[in-house]
């Protein structure tokens, strides 16, 4: 499903290519902004975001941000241009097809972020790189 408030033009006229010359088409990403989450102490979680969006620009990638403080845990899912910082951090892993979470230094909270470039790749956020996607027992996340 593509929600109208985030669905943007799929621009076939202004061609954007990657470093190999392949056309970069607008990507499909989970796009729920910030939601409360119970994803904690797991190797992997599903976003449980029901909104799949076509990103506004072909160069945008999927991003997920997991934050934990004394009060709650949140998961943010968006599209974002990797040329621009997000939450003051560069998206170093934007070319990855999977969303491998990396911890970032943020005072007062635990902060993980990942970015990736395959359709809806921020639906499955991976905290352990050796995680095997075929194990369904690791895919539990409930939103409040």
């Amino acid at each position: 499903t593509i929600p109208p408030h985030v669905q943007k033009s799929v621009n076939n006229d202004m061609i954007v290519t990657d470093n190999n010359g392949a056309v970069k088409f607008p990507q499909l990403c989970k796009f729920c902004d910030v939601r409360f989450s119970t994803c904690d102490n797991q190797k992997s979680c599903m976003s449980n975001c029901s909104i799949t969006s076509i990103c506004e620009k072909p160069q945008e990638v999927c991003v997920a941000v997991w934050r934990k403080n004394d009060e709650n845990i949140t998961l943010e899912t968006v599209c974002h241009d990797p040329k621009l910082p997000y939450h003051d951090f560069i998206l170093e892993d934007a070319a990855s097809p999977k969303c491998i979470m990396k911890e970032k230094k943020k005072p007062g909270e635990t902060f993980f972020m990942c970015s990736c470039s395959s359709d809806e790749c921020n639906d499955n956020i991976i905290f352990s790189e050796e995680y095997n996607t075929s194990n369904p027992d690791l895919l539990l996340v409930i939103f409040q």
């Epitope: 929600p3 109208p4 392949a22 056309v23 097809p97 395959s118 790749c121 075929s134």
Partner: antibody
Amino acid sequence: QVQLVESGGGLVEPGGSLRLSCAASGFTFSNAWMSWVRQAPGKGLEWVGRIKTTYSGGATDFAAPVKGRFTISRDDSKNTLYLQMNSLKTEDTAVYYCTLDLRDYWGQGTLVTVSS
Amino acid sequence: DIQMTQSPSSLSASVGDRVTITCRASQSISSYLNWYQQKPGKAPKLLIYAASSLQSGVPSRFSGSGSGTDFTLTISSLQPEDFATYYCQQSYSTPPTFGQGTKVEIK
């Protein structure tokens, strides 16, 4: 330039099988959800099914009329999408289009005729 | 599945005419509605997405409106290249279903 080229269409008898292929180029195929849409002669468009990326498990969805008879697969190493059609019926006669799911890229279509 | 019903199924019009095609969904689909144009022997081309947003490269004489269950595609001044078949499609839920099409013919 994005290119989607379907092949494998032809004449088949009712109850028979056929496998369509879609060769993709010009984009990172492995990163994309892909769909099949069909159009019976002189009729409208009908979504057949989709396959998600291998990275997310390669899950598939199908329209009710083809569920259990058609399967969709992909070979990311060959940049190729497949539609395996079994137990074909005369009402499956159509031009089958390969599409980049939910985006405006379509192949030229390949005609499948189911007839005795 | 959500059923999409277009009307009329065909219409005859002249160059310069204002043309309106309607699409009704069997249940509310918010604004998750796309319009396609198809010419004989060709693949469909996306014109309007999210009910009212114009796809890049599509002439501004095409416009879309509506939300919920009732939607409209309008061609403000029909041009020779606009004679084609038009389809609505909902992208609210899987399967993403199409209307049966509206053929716009030369009067």
